[in-house]
Interface confidence: low
């Protein structure tokens, strides 16, 4: 039987009446144009909604926007357009919301052609009040907040100037001209690339990388011949042009660009690219594009310094620079990532890793599903997940995979069951153990969201027709109830719930269409009365993550430790609550070869945990370039995986000697770096 239709599904008592009392409609006094929604702060209940409507006139486009504010999670909205002097707000800049709970908001206004600069509206009290500020420049990008101090803002101008404000946008100063890309680093540091000759495009590969640690009082050139740069975790990466030809290589720094090392990664040509797929303070996943327009490349995982890389996955699907990849961090379980590979016959298959890229496997076939016609063997096939690439290809996939750190183990995604991703209409699948096992949750495509840290899952069918029904589950997608939230169906445009999945409110957005007009409408449903009581100790059960063999003493060991979680029982209908904190008990594991990656000059043959010397390096001294010095490596081939906490057990020997010899990296060596002050 279909999920949610078997006899074991008990109904939630009197839910229709409970939800009806907690369903709030708001009709916006707007013609339907576009709508964008932002949450201001965490657990504040404050939502800003910006609606914009373009009237195309013969000579120009006339725009009108309205700003609405809710402070009760979307149940009621107040029109606050007068606070921004009824100004038309530029939607391409969105609403720049400050970090953490700063309560800061910046809106960028549309200004007439001849004006000296742009205009912003600033709020530092969760959008209760706004201050209008005229800018001495026209912004090219959205204002960027420093992660450490929300009063510090940076922006690029249409003339490629780098502008900084130290008082939340009240006063602005141009600290550098000819800037291509600027990013905040840690400790209020700004990294940016500059061009010397014509433009960013013309100087690509000849850019300079600069750093300022004092908001523009002084500068240091930390790199030359730069193509691009990126920040990930504690790593600063730069792709640098080679001296001799048009190839480029990745260099990495862990000290804000004072010293650099060449990453042991393949160089790439003009048409290829590097991409940081994921990074944390321990390591980085790097994609290196294949030569030619293949649409795939190789994933490499780094060591703890970002220098030595192990090949993680071949034929990784990634279409073009800035194109589509399905790489997804499953945030509900440590070490889990999902992505797609392009097989030899050009079909797309999903792969999953449970150990941060150490090994990749296919997803296990869901118990309650049959293999489709993509499968050669009807009894043996896998689940294949639809993500960004499927969405870009306009397949019938309304949403990417979903996981939340505080909904432990839960992953929801569209998928098909066979030997490859199918063009057929997908179904929705759920895993409650971080991707090890899967179950078909809903027939056909749906929008879905997680509420109350996994206590409730909400879904709406993806349909071209107007809808008025929402589905919800209180047992991690096993059983579903349906609730008709309005008599008059609406054209659905999106589900909105507060980021972090702690809320019990869901907003259904859409528009109503009549013969003469169409209007935005939202329905906010509060599920607090469905989960009547607070969860108690008896509602939780102990769950060992990554458990595959309970008989094995090392069961659940991933990256050197195992974790036991307290998880809500599926049968318990209660509130985790907004203050819910994931309870976990870690325990250290003994080291095995699985806890080590292969060192520079070594590789792991398939289906083998031992690292063996690369044939071309056999008998050679292993020397590599580190911080501009040549290092001699004495190793038996192993290096501990970044973030691995194992102790005891296997302990391979490793020693690095400084050869006290300079080695050439075509990058700027430390002594050549210059500084200057303003």
């Amino acid at each position: 039987s279909a999920p949610g239709e078997d006899e074991e599904c008990g109904r939630v008592r009197d839910f229709v009446a409970k939800l009806a009392n907690n369903t709030h409609q708001h009709v916006f006094d707007d013609l339907r144009g576009s709508v964008s929604l932002s949450w201001v702060g965490d657990s504040t209940g404050v939502i800003l909604v910006l609606t914009t409507f373009h009237v195309p006139l013969v000579i120009m486009t006339f725009g009108q926007s309205k700003l609405y504010r809710s402070e009760d999670y979307g149940k009621n909205f107040k029109d606050i357009t007068d606070l921004i002097n009824n100004t038309f707000i530029r939607t391409e800049f969105g609403m720049a919301i400050g970090p953490e709970n700063s309560g800061k908001v910046v809106l960028t206004a549309e200004v007439s052609g001849g004006s000296r600069g742009g205009r912003i509206f600033r709020s530092s009290d969760f959008a209760k009040n706004f201050v209008q500020t005229d800018l001495p420049f026209h912004p090219l990008t959205q204002m960027m907040y420093s992660p450490q101090n929300s009063d510090y803002l940076l922006a690029l101008s249409t003339e490629n100037g780098l502008w900084v404000s130290k008082n939340f946008g009240g006063k602005w100063e141009e600290i550098h001209k000819a800037v291509c890309l600027a990013k905040w680093g840690s400790d209020n540091t700004i990294f940016f690339t500059t061009y010397a000759n014509g433009s960013c495009k013309a100087d690509l590969g000849a850019l300079e990388l600069w750093r300022t640690s004092d908001l523009g009082k002084s500068f240091k050139t930390i790199g030359v011949k730069i193509y691009s740069f990126g920040l990930g975790g504690r790593f600063l990466f730069a792709s640098v042009m080679a001296d001799k030809d048009t190839t480029r290589r990745i260099h990495v720094s862990t000290d804000q660009g004072d010293t650099w090392s060449m990453a042991q990664l393949p160089s790439v040509g003009q048409e290829q690219f590097y991409s940081i797929l994921a990074a944390n303070d321990d390591m980085v996943f790097m994609h290196v594009d294949e030569p030619g327009d293949t649409g795939f490349g190789t994933i490499f995982t780094s060591d703890d310094r970002g220098i030595v890389y192990s090949k993680s996955l071949d034929r990784h699907l990634y279409t073009t620079t800035g194109g589509e990849t399905d790489f997804t961090n499953v945030t509900s379980l440590r070490g889990v990532y999902i992505t797609s590979v392009l097989s030899e016959d050009n079909s797309i298959q999903t792969m999953i890793t449970f150990d941060q890229g150490g090994r990749w496997t296919h997803l296990r076939k869901p118990e309650n599903s049959e293999c489709d016609a993509t499968a050669k063997n009807k009894n043996e096939c896998s689940l294949h997940i639809h993500a960004s690439y499927s969405i870009s290809q306009k397949l019938n996939v309304p949403m990417a995979p979903l996981s939340e750190p505080n909904a432990v183990g839960i992953v929801i995604a569209h998928g098909s069951v066979g030997d490859a991703i199918s063009v057929m209409v997908p179904d929705v699948y759920i895993s409650d153990d971080g991707g090890y096992s899967w179950t078909k949750m809903l027939e056909g495509p749906h929008y879905y969201t997680i509420l109350d840290s996994g206590g409730i899952i909400v879904a709406i069918e993806h349909s071209s027709r107007p809808i008025n029904v929402i589905k919800f589950s209180t047992d991690e997608g096993q059983c579903w109830q349906t609730y008709t939230f309005t008599r008059d169906p609406i054209y659905f445009t999106g589900l909105a719930s507060e980021p972090g999945a702690r809320s019990m409110n869901i907003s259904i957005w859409g528009f109503t269409e009549s013969f003469l007009t169409s209007q935005w409408v939202s329905y906010t449903i509060d599920f607090k009365d469905i989960l009547e009581r607070n969860c108690e100790e008896k509602d939780y059960t102990i769950w060992l993550a990554h458990s595959t063999d309970p008989e094995d003493y090392e069961d659940g060991c991933i990256l050197g430790y195992k974790e036991q979680f307290l998880r809500l029982r599926k049968s318990s209908v209660c509130q985790n609550g907004r203050d819910y904190v994931v309870t976990k008990q870690p325990s250290i594991c003994l080291c095995s070869l699985e806890d080590f990656l292969c060192d520079f000059g070594y590789y792991r043959p398939e289906n083998d945990s031992k690292c063996v010397e690369q044939p071309e390096l056999k008998g050679h001294d292993l020397e590599f370039c580190l911080y501009g010095r040549e290092e001699h490596l004495t190793t038996n081939g192993y290096r501990k995986i970044p973030g691995d906490k194992c102790q005891g057990g296997v302990n391979p020997v490793r020693e690095v000697k400084d050869l006290k010899k300079k080695c050439t990296s075509n990058f700027l060596s430390p002594e050549k770096q210059n500084s200057k002050s303003n």
Epitope: L342, A373, K378, Y389, L395, G418, D419, S422, V423, M424
Partner: antibody
Framework: QVQLVQSGAEVKKPGASVKVSCKAS????????MSWVRQAPGQGLEWMGI????????SYAQKFQGRVTMTRDTSTSTVYMELSSLRSEDTAVYYC??????????????????????WGQGTTVTVSS | EIVMTQSPATLSVSPGERATLSCRAS??????LAWYQQKPGQAPRLLIY???TRATGIPARFSGSGSGTEFTLTISSLQSEDFAVYYC?????????FGGGTKVEIK
């Protein structure tokens, strides 16, 4: 040999429904997809949708969404196409065609497409009051 | 949806001559393209798949070329049995779509 045999001609009134069958033989029925294509008098070919005979999942062209239903019976190796709320402009010859590579989403390079390699003889449906 | 445009609508050729039929896609279909031949009162017949591969039993005088958005079907030396309507069809993205057809008639 591989063949697809369709049901006979039908005459229907506007607003009625028609159900056309297509019986496959000479190959493993569930191993490959089946498309339905129609051709109005003097007009070109128009793709209506596709069914996976193994799992029964379907994908329909937007134009026919809500009016067309494709089903299959694996015990008789037959696929069916039902079109409801018939109008005069639905008068056409309806073909089933084996579509071996409706199977996987295309990669960014080319997925190999094998074409609709076997066609039924066609079923004429006339809608007239 | 991807729109397929065939040209010319009608092509008049003498037997023994070469015929070149064009098919253009509104966006790239890579090589996910097939050509079909249809004679009056008959079902279409697959000629070319994968843009350039001849289907089983199709004579060597039929050849397909192109990739992306521009495709060509060439009949090197027309035989009397080749006078028919020819359709191209893409299968890059659903819904599959056909061109309007090119009628090859005797000059």
């Amino acid at each position: 040999q591989v063949q697809l045999v369709q049901s006979g001609a039908e005459v229907k009134k506007p607003g009625a429904s028609v159900k056309v069958s297509c019986k496959a033989s000479g190959y493993t029925f569930t191993s490959t997809y089946m498309s339905w294509v129609r051709q109005a008098p003097g007009q070109g070919l128009e793709w209506m949708g596709i069914i996976n005979p193994y799992g029964g999942s379907t994908s329909y062209a937007q134009k026919f969404q809500g009016r067309v239903t494709m089903t299959r019976d694996t015990s008789t190796s037959t696929v069916y196409m039902e079109l409801s709320s018939l109008r005069s402009e639905d008068t056409a010859v309806y073909y089933c065609a084996r579509d071996p590579s409706g199977i996987a989403a295309a990669g960014p390079a080319s997925r190999y497409y094998y074409g609709m390699d076997v066609w039924g003889q066609g079923t004429t449906v006339t809608v007239s009051s | 949806e991807i729109v397929m445009t065939q040209s010319p609508a009608t092509l008049s050729v003498s037997p023994g001559e070469r015929a070149t039929l064009s098919c253009r896609a509104s966006q790239s279909v890579s090589s996910n393209l097939a050509w079909y031949q249809q004679k009056p009162g008959q079902a279409p017949r697959l000629l070319i798949y994968g843009a350039s591969t001849r289907a089983t039993g199709i004579p060597a005088r039929f050849s397909g070329s192109g990739s992306g958005t521009e495709f060509t079907l060439t009949i090197s030396s027309l035989q009397s049995e080749d006078f028919a309507v020819y359709y191209c069809q893409q299968a890059r993205l659903g819904p599959w779509t056909f061109g309007g057809g090119t009628k090859v008639e005797i000059k």
